[in-house]
Interface confidence: low
């Protein structure tokens, strides 16, 4: 006869690991006893059970409560064992040595892989602003054993660059993604991906990019002077930008005080009805806690009776 | 223009804690850190730490058990305590202003503080 | 921490000289390296940061290069009133400054 067992166990943190010992053998043979020994390289035998025909199973005291016989039906010629809630330092070298009749003792070694799923974490990197040069976006890590894979996925361009350290019994993977921020970047997802034996599916923690900016600011309203004429209701200037964090707008008049009358509202600038009071330098601030810029625009305000000759010159100009 | 200003007693006896104000005029210190870096007679500039306009500190870990910066906002005024010194201690102490990164755009010009009994 | 290694310690140069610098860091340190000059009972003026930026009213001499652990100062045409100590300094977590170059006249 001859002894069927596995080379390799693998079995995930906290589940219980089949240690497999199957005496195949010949019409009227018989298994007396199987005894089961751990047996790591340098480190001498240490007993686990003793599984006996006739008086059952005998469990060492280091692995009292720990390890068990397979639920019924049994076979007569089965010495597997059940080794309970299996921990990194279960991790080894196992023997199973069964006494036959009449054929004698035969014995059969295996390897019990414990595998330790990762717990990854995310860390952002620092505040990320639009004029950086390459920036740490976030780091990802993830310990377990075997080592994890930890990778990312995005539609960010950037470089990733990875280390790991290994511990007795496990290792830790850091991976860290670096990109040049820009505006473009902004609400994107980032996402670390970690892979691992231990792991039914892929592990992934997200972290959405926030990159600080702040768009040139212009001004829109003057772009057909002729409406700025005395009396004209409704005249508004309107400032352009864009920027995270959202940015706060403040106007001014460069050539003293606002006029009386004009309507701040955020990004607009609302006239009253025209007078040449109105006509000046009007700066849109624009701001937020990443920069500022500044525009300014120069509102002439026409007087149809002054102007219009200079109307007509204008219209037949462009 | 933003300038900084250290002041403080030049002298302190070993093992007292040596304190030292920077006082920040001309400019907003909102979005900005406050950093405190040393350099011993001769030698080379070491970095202490940072607070933000905020009240958040960062200290370089070598001297984080002996190194308090605080922040009075209302007077733009920010304090360096350094506690247990030696004469190992003796440099100029400069103020300086950065940005989130830490690189140092505008420095004080420097206190001695002599550490001797 | 990262430890920064600058060369060298001293050179002698002339007014007109092409004068290079260089600091290395322990690790990468990506584009995060500022240099700044230095002169007698003054405090550091920052010239150049974020690797090559150079700092508003820097003369255009001035320029800086690298990324990664190797770093290079250079100034194009030096004139006197560059002759001072030069220092880098890496802002990837706990800042450091080099040892320290000086610039010394011929």
């Known amino acids: 006869g001859e002894l069927e067992t596995s080379d390799v166990v693998t079995v995930v943190l906290g589940q219980d690991a089949k240690l497999p010992c199957f005496y195949r053998g010949d019409s009227g043979e018989q298994v007396g006893q199987v005894a089961w020994a751990r047996v790591d390289a340098g480190e001498g035998a240490q007993e686990l059970a003793l599984l006996h025909s006739k008086y059952g199973l005998h469990v060492s005291p280091a692995y009292e409560g720990r390890v068990e016989q397979p639920p019924p039906p049994r076979n007569p010629l089965d010495g597997s064992v059940l080794l309970r809630n299996a921990v990194q330092a279960d991790e080894g070298e196992y023997e199973c040595r069964v006494s036959t009749f009449p054929a004698g003792s035969f014995q059969a070694r295996l390897r019990l892989r414990v595998l330790v799923p990762p717990l990854p974490s995310l860390n952002p990197g620092p505040a990320l602003e639009e004029g950086q040069g390459l920036t740490l976006a976030a780091s990802c890590t993830a310990e377990g054993s075997p080592a994890p894979s930890v990778t990312w996925d995005t539609e960010v361009k950037g470089t990733t660059s990875s280390r790991s350290f290994k511990h007795s019994r496990s290792a830790a993977v850091t991976s860290e993604f670096h990109l040049v921020p820009s505006r473009s970047m902004n609400g994107q997802p980032l996402t670390c991906v970690v892979s691992h034996p231990g792991l039914l599916q892929d592990q992934r923690i997200t972290h959405i990019l926030h990159v600080s900016f702040l768009a040139e600011a212009s001004v829109r309203g003057l772009e057909d002077q002729n409406l700025w004429h005395i009396g004209r209701e409704g005249a508004m200037l309107k400032c352009l930008s864009e920027g995270q964090p959202p940015p706060s707008y403040n106007w001014t008049r460069l050539d003293g005080p606002l006029p009386s009358g004009v309507r701040v509202d955020g990004d607009t600038l609302g006239f009253p009805p025209l007078t040449t009071e109105h006509s000046g330098i009007y700066v849109c601030h624009v701001s937020n806690e990443f920069s500022s810029r500044d525009s300014q625009v120069t509102v002439d305000v026409l007087d149809p009776q002054e102007d219009s000759g200079k109307q007509v010159d204008l219209v037949s100009a462009s | 223009q933003v300038q900084l200003q250290e002041s403080g007693p030049g002298l302190v006896k070993p093992s007292e804690t040596l304190s030292l104000t920077c006082t920040v005029s001309?400019?907003?210190?909102?979005?900005?850190?406050v950093h405190w870096i040393r350099q011993p007679p001769g030698k080379g500039l070491e970095w202490l730490g940072v607070i933000w306009s905020g009240g958040s500190t960062d200290y370089n870990p070598s001297l984080k058990s002996r190194v308090t910066i605080s922040v009075d906002t209302s007077k733009n005024q920010f304090s360096l305590k350094l506690s247990s010194v030696t004469a190992a201690d003796t440099a100029v102490y400069y103020c300086?202003?950065?940005?989130?990164?830490?690189?140092?755009?505008?420095w004080g010009q420097g206190t001695l503080v002599t550490v001797s009994s | 921490d990262i430890q920064m290694t600058q060369s060298p310690s001293s050179l002698s140069a002339s007014v007109g000289d092409r004068v290079t610098i260089t600091c290395r860091a322990s690790q990468s340190i990506y584009s995060n390296l500022a240099w700044y000059q230095q002169k007698p009972g003054k405090a550091p003026k920052l010239l150049v940061y974020a690797a090559t930026n150079l700092q508003s009213g820097v003369p255009s001499r001035f320029s800086g290069s690298g990324s990664g652990t190797d770093f290079t100062l250079t100034i194009s045409s030096l004139q006197p009133e560059d002759f001072a100590t030069y220092y880098c300094q890496h802002f990837w977590g706990t800042p450091t400054f080099g040892g320290g170059t000086k610039v010394e006249i011929k």
């Open positions: 300086a202003r950065s940005g989130k990164w830490y690189y140092f755009d505008y």
């Open positions: 001309g400019g907003s210190i909102t979005n900005y850190g």
